[in-house]
Interface confidence: medium
């Protein structure tokens, strides 16, 4: 039975050219996290954090994605094209798969503030 819940940074905004932290947190379960996958809105994989092997950043994003903090992901040198949904997928044993959603809006304005509050989707 899947008892866990994924908390995410929810809807966030950040400045063009800046950076942003995408963060998910799995709680209310004793399941072992074997892997966390980070995907972009078009379903392309940004990065994988495997419990045994550590981080793998996919080549297309190598220059703009930094692993962490923790199981999160830092997107750098943001462009307007980075606006959209991001998904964290937690592969766990024995529960199975948990999925969280974050919506990132990249703003041209210099007054854009990076809001990062945790919320349960």
């Amino acid at each position: 039975m899947m008892t866990g819940t994924i908390e995410t940074t929810g809807n966030i905004s950040a400045k063009k050219g800046g950076s942003v932290i995408l963060q998910c947190h799995l709680s209310s379960t004793m399941a072992q996290v074997t892997q966390v996958n980070w995907e972009q809105h078009d379903h392309s994989l940004l990065a994988i954090r495997n419990a045994e092997l550590g981080w793998h950043i996919y080549p297309a994003f190598k220059d703009r994605v930094a692993p962490g903090p923790g199981l999160g992901l830092t997107l750098q040198s943001l462009t307007m094209n980075d606006t959209g949904e991001y998904f964290c997928t937690y592969h766990t044993y024995p529960d199975g798969t948990y999925r969280g959603r974050i919506f990132l809006e990249v703003l041209e304005s210099s007054v854009a503030e990076h809001s990062a509050r945790f919320q349960i989707p």
Epitope: H43, S44, E52, L53, G54, H91
Partner: antibody
Framework: QVQLVQSGAEVKKPGASVKVSCKAS????????MHWVRQAPGQGLEWMGV????????SYAQKFQGRVTLTRDTSTSTVYMELSSLRSEDTAVYYC??????????????WGQGTMVTVSS | EIVLTQSPGTLSLSPGERATLSCRAS???????LAWYQQKPGQAPRLLIY???SRATGIPDRFSGSGSGTDFTLTISRLEPEDFAVYYC?????????FGGGTKVEIK
Amino acid sequence: QVQLVQSGAEVKKPGASVKVSCKASGYTFTSYYMHWVRQAPGQGLEWMGVIGPSGASTSYAQKFQGRVTLTRDTSTSTVYMELSSLRSEDTAVYYCARDHSDYWSGIMEVWGQGTMVTVSS
Amino acid sequence: EIVLTQSPGTLSLSPGERATLSCRASQSVRSSYLAWYQQKPGQAPRLLIYGASSRATGIPDRFSGSGSGTDFTLTISRLEPEDFAVYYCQQYFSPPWTFGGGTKVEIK
């Protein structure tokens, strides 16, 4: 050019252990992950495990967990695969294969020539 | 783990003909993280295609890969004598990395 040269054929008794070596040349040894794959006679390919550039990170297929150990010796640019508690079903050709990427991509780009391990009483 | 099923098991064709090999995944292989390998008798496998459609270094352009999600295809446009071999697909979406059972392309 990139080359992986494996140790020679082995004949072992059931219950024994075998240690196969894979010597790398033609690239920066400490930058790439190394996979091990086996192939029983007339059968398909079976991934066994992978070891990271420093040797600190390893991941094994569940089937081999507890029986296989991957290690690497940076001074000789050699990776080792040790399989214990051998049984007749372990009779196979064992291959080392270098990863395609300096992160672990899972793409096996360059292969050793293979080492035949025969388990027989 | 992701199970890959290849079909047909054996393909009997003549040199010059077109070969179409299929690989089906038990679940979606996101972003086309699928590779194809060629293996000749007594030899180690050789990487042909990665990313479902990108040819590895030195692979002739008669080899092409396509597909996404759960269905992938390797096409050899015109079989050369040296192409008769066993072909394996492999997913590298996430560990444990798995291979299909293989398709043998033999001379008719």
